[in-house]
């Protein structure tokens, strides 16, 4: 599992010797170090929206921000896959889609994003405090999962301001551009470290706000998500999980799976106009495979999802499948 780079809080330098210039040169290496450590890390974003017209209807959208090829997407609710979550849909880019009640329609939006319409009545009906998770098995990165839910205060049908979000796909130009900047940054960091090697090391103290806070992104679009507090997964309110779960089976798989034919998409569509899809403010979760999550704060307009993602420590498809049955 990749180590998380924490950006420690720096004590202000002694007045005089370096002054403002000294402060800048002390902070910059840490920012660049974070940039180097987090370079090329794939991410998963999750958007959950309740339809204004049908209060029991949800739309879950998930996307993968990475250069790899997606080999499987698993959407679950009630927690991450293999950690008590119940599979709602599995999408394979070549073989098609499998979905189970209360999922109504799962489909590929682009080659790296999917959507799932969920509806139900009675026991299998989702509600506002249900947590939905998306797990992307990608080649060659491995498995990445993120979770999201509507906060209790959300109004039905509410979404982020209709401002265009950046295109949610890592194209070649972007990769090359970022790679160049990162390479320059890393070289510059080495240069700075060499310059400072004879100077006394600055006194560092750990951040008081949250010892487990996700690492700060160098280009962090959401400050709130950087300082998000991690709490145990057990605190998630899953009172709206279906009461008819097949508890006789350890994987928690439902015994009421859909018996109607699924959406017959056998290949993802080409990249659609996802740039115009508004990403809702709030209601996003950052998921950690070991059972931690954090609610990401409101993000400013004109920014794409900036969720911090943690890789599956057990590698791709570690549970041998979405239900973790063996």
């Amino acid at each position: 599992m990749r180590t998380e780079a924490q950006v420690p809080a720096l004590q202000p330098p002694e007045p005089g010797l370096e002054g403002a210039m000294g402060h800048r040169t002390l902070v910059l290496p840490w920012v660049l170090l974070t940039l180097c450590v987090t370079a090329g890390t794939p991410e998963v974003w999750v958007q959950v929206r309740m339809e204004a017209t049908e209060l029991s209807s949800f739309t879950i959208r998930c996307g993968f921000l990475g250069s790899g090829s997606i080999s499987l997407v698993t959407v679950s609710w009630g927690g991450p896959n293999g950690a008590g979550g119940t599979t709602l849909a599995v999408l394979h880019p070549e073989r098609g889609i499998r979905q189970w009640a209360p999922a109504r329609q799962a489909r590929w939006e682009t080659q790296s994003s999917i959507s799932l319409i969920l509806e139900g009545s009675g026991a299998s009906s989702p509600c506002a405090n249900t947590t939905f998770c998306c797990k992307f098995a990608s080649f060659p990165e491995g498995s990445w999962e993120a979770c999201g839910s509507l906060p209790p205060s959300s109004d039905p049908g509410l979404s982020a301001p209709p401002t265009p979000a950046p295109i949610l796909r890592a194209d070649l130009a972007g990769i090359l551009g970022v790679s160049g900047v990162l390479l320059f940054g890393c070289v510059y960091l080495l240069h700075l470290l060499r310059r400072h090697k004879h100077r006394p090391a600055p006194r560092l103290q750990p951040s008081r706000t949250s010892p487990q806070a996700p690492r700060a992104r160098a280009w962090a679009p959401s400050q709130a998500s950087q300082a998000a507090l991690h709490v145990p997964y057990a605190t998630i309110n899953t009172s709206c999980r279906p009461a008819t779960l097949d508890t006789a089976h350890p994987h928690g798989g439902p015994s009421w799976w859909a018996s109607l034919p699924t959406h017959a998409a056998h290949r993802p569509q080409g990249p659609a106009a996802w740039a115009s899809t508004p990403i809702p403010a709030r209601g996003s979760f950052v998921s950690v495979e070991n059972g931690l999550y954090a609610q990401a704060g409101e993000r400013p307009p004109h920014t794409g999802p900036g969720l911090t993602l943690f890789p599956d420590p057990r590698g791709p498809r570690a549970m041998e499948g979405p239900l973790g049955v063996r």
């Epitope: 080649f139 097949d246 799976w257 109607l260 017959a264």
Partner: antibody, heavy 117, light 107 residues
Framework: EVQLVESGGGLVQPGGSLRLSCAAS????????MHWVRQATGKGLEWVSD???????YYLDSVKGRFTISRENAKNSLYLQMNSLRAGDTAVYYC????FGHGMDVWGQGTTVTVSS | DIQMTQSPSSLSASVGDRVTITCRAS??????LGWYQQKPGKAPKRLIY???SLQSGVPSRFSGSGSGTEFTLTISSLQPEDFATYYC?????????FGGGTKVEIK
């Protein structure tokens, strides 16, 4: 214990029909794709057909139009209706479980189908 | 259809030997590949899934590697019970296809 038990094999004349059954136990049957795989004596394995959780079906080209895969989730049962049988269909037929997208993990012991005059 | 070319078709080895079997796909299949062991008169048993993940209960001397079009099954130290026929299977697209098999015999 997860188990798949095939039945229905036997000797049949070319052009005849046979219906194979597979009884599943020890897991939630409706959660899985189910497959039929065959193996002629002394030969390699050959995939025959797949049925998804909601009834989506897929076939090997050489059996399309002759074989029909079906499932009865309430009975934890998988079937393969084989019509217009040919000598080339002679093989041991295995019932196999697959968690969609993750490959075949559990196999039955097989049932033998012999097509001969 | 995706063709799976498995080599060698047979090999002779001794207990303790390191054995390598390869499978080549006619087109990219990401990591949608499994390795199976079959003994005479028995059903196949899965050893490796997702190209490189060890099936629960399978000894760690078995390992898988590769992705895309080239895949390898390695037995680090051959044991008497490992003499069998090994198959690769691609489940990336329909129809699923198996490699032709590799029979591992006692030298």
């Amino acid at each position: 214990e997860v188990q798949l038990v095939e039945s229905g094999g036997g000797l049949v004349q070319p052009g005849g029909s046979l219906r194979l059954s597979c009884a599943a136990s020890g897991f939630t049957f409706s959660n899985y794709d189910m497959h039929w795989v065959r193996q002629a004596t002394g030969k390699g394995l050959e995939w025959v057909s797949d049925i998804g959780n909601a009834g989506e079906t897929y076939y090997l080209d050489s059996v399309k139009g002759r074989f029909t895969i079906s499932r009865e989730n309430a009975k934890n049962s998988l079937y393969l209706q084989m019509n217009s049988l040919r000598a080339g269909d002679t093989a041991v037929y295995y019932c196999v479980r697959e968690e969609f997208g993750h490959g075949m993990d559990v196999w039955g012991q097989g049932t033998t189908v012999t097509v001969s005059s | 259809d995706i063709q799976m070319t498995q080599s060698p078709s047979s090999l002779s080895a001794s207990v303790g030997d390191r054995v390598t079997i390869t499978c080549r796909a006619s087109q990219g299949i990401r990591s949608d590949l499994g390795w199976y062991q079959q003994k005479p008169g028995k059903a196949p048993k899965r050893l490796i899934y997702a190209a490189s993940s060890l099936q629960s209960g399978v000894p760690s001397r078995f390992s898988g590697s590769g992705s895309g079009t080239e895949f390898t099954l390695t037995i680090s130290s051959l044991q008497p019970e490992d003499f069998a026929t090994y198959y690769c299977l691609q489940h990336n697209s329909y129809p699923f296809t198996f490699g032709g098999g590799t029979k591992v015999e006692i030298k």
